[in-house]
Interface confidence: medium
């Protein structure tokens, strides 16, 4: 026997108060399958976090970072503080990279200098904190 | 006992007016998030317009923005839609019900009224 919830469209939820009716989603919320009971409530982009898609009725909101910020986790839980190129973030805000490490975004850590010796070769260029050593022949 | 009773509705011709209400006995509409949705003559159900968050936020399909307007007044416990320049798609039976946040993170309305036709018609 078919459930008669499986015909209720994405957008919509099975209403069990009224004889398994489909019933709309109220606002702020949405259903992206078919045959669901509830509808899900809508993810909110406030503070550090700006709307990047609107929910609707069938598709949850998506949100990104305000300028400064960068996104972290699936689908961006988390905004993370920018730095500048040549620093990481540190507990106590952005640093500057040690000498003989590098970070050429605006995120994520130093890194150290590529060591080109380990190649047999030598160093064409040298590393700053913002760019990693060039290595030649 | 928890109940919703729509009134208001009517005939009226293209362009005109209607107020419907919404008496709710058995709860406060003033601390619950409560709306309005239609069923059009062989169509399915559409929402038409709520307030959420204690009456902070209002709410309008796109189908009604600028024409209907949902208020309430807490002393008589009694939901209001005004419609303005109704048109011939704005025929169908209007509901008032509550939007019910569950514990699992579900939402859905209940407590329906019996409904309230509206027939926009020359």
């Known amino acids: 026997l078919q459930d008669p919830c499986s015909n209720c469209p994405a957008g919509t939820f099975c209403d069990n108060n009224r004889n398994q009716i489909c019933s709309p989603c109220p606002p702020n919320s949405f259903s992206s399958a078919g045959g669901q009971r509830t509808c899900d409530i809508c993810r909110q982009c406030k503070g550090v976090f700006r709307t990047r898609k609107e929910c609707s009725s069938t598709s949850n909101a998506e949100c990104d970072c305000t300028p400064g910020f960068h996104c972290l986790g699936a689908g961006c839980s988390m905004c993370e503080q920018d730095c500048k190129q040549g620093q990481e973030l540190t507990k106590k805000g952005c640093k500057d990279c040690c000498f003989g490490t590098f970070n050429d975004q605006k995120r994520g850590i130093c890194r150290p200098w590529t060591n080109c010796s380990l190649d047999g070769k030598s160093v064409l260029v040298n590393g700053t904190k913002e760019r990693d050593v060039v290595c030649g022949p | 006992e928890v109940q919703l009773l729509e009134s208001g509705g009517g005939l009226v011709q293209p362009g005109g007016s209607l107020r419907l209400s919404c008496a709710a006995s058995?709860?406060?509409?003033?601390?619950?998030?409560v709306g309005w949705v239609r069923q059009a003559p062989g169509k399915g159900l559409e929402w038409v317009s709520a307030i959420l968050d204690f009456g902070g936020s209002t709410y309008y399909a796109d189908s009604v923005k600028g024409r209907f307007t949902i208020s309430r007044d807490n002393s008589k416990n009694t939901l209001y839609l005004q419609m303005n320049s109704l048109r011939a798609e704005d025929t169908a039976v209007y509901y008032c019900?509550?939007?019910?946040?569950?514990?699992?993170?579900?939402?859905?309305?209940?407590?329906w009224g019996q409904g309230t036709l509206v027939t926009v018609s020359s």
């Open positions: 058995g709860f406060m509409l003033s601390a619950e998030d």
């Open positions: 019900a509550r939007v019910v946040y569950h514990a699992g993170g579900g939402v859905t309305f209940d407590y």
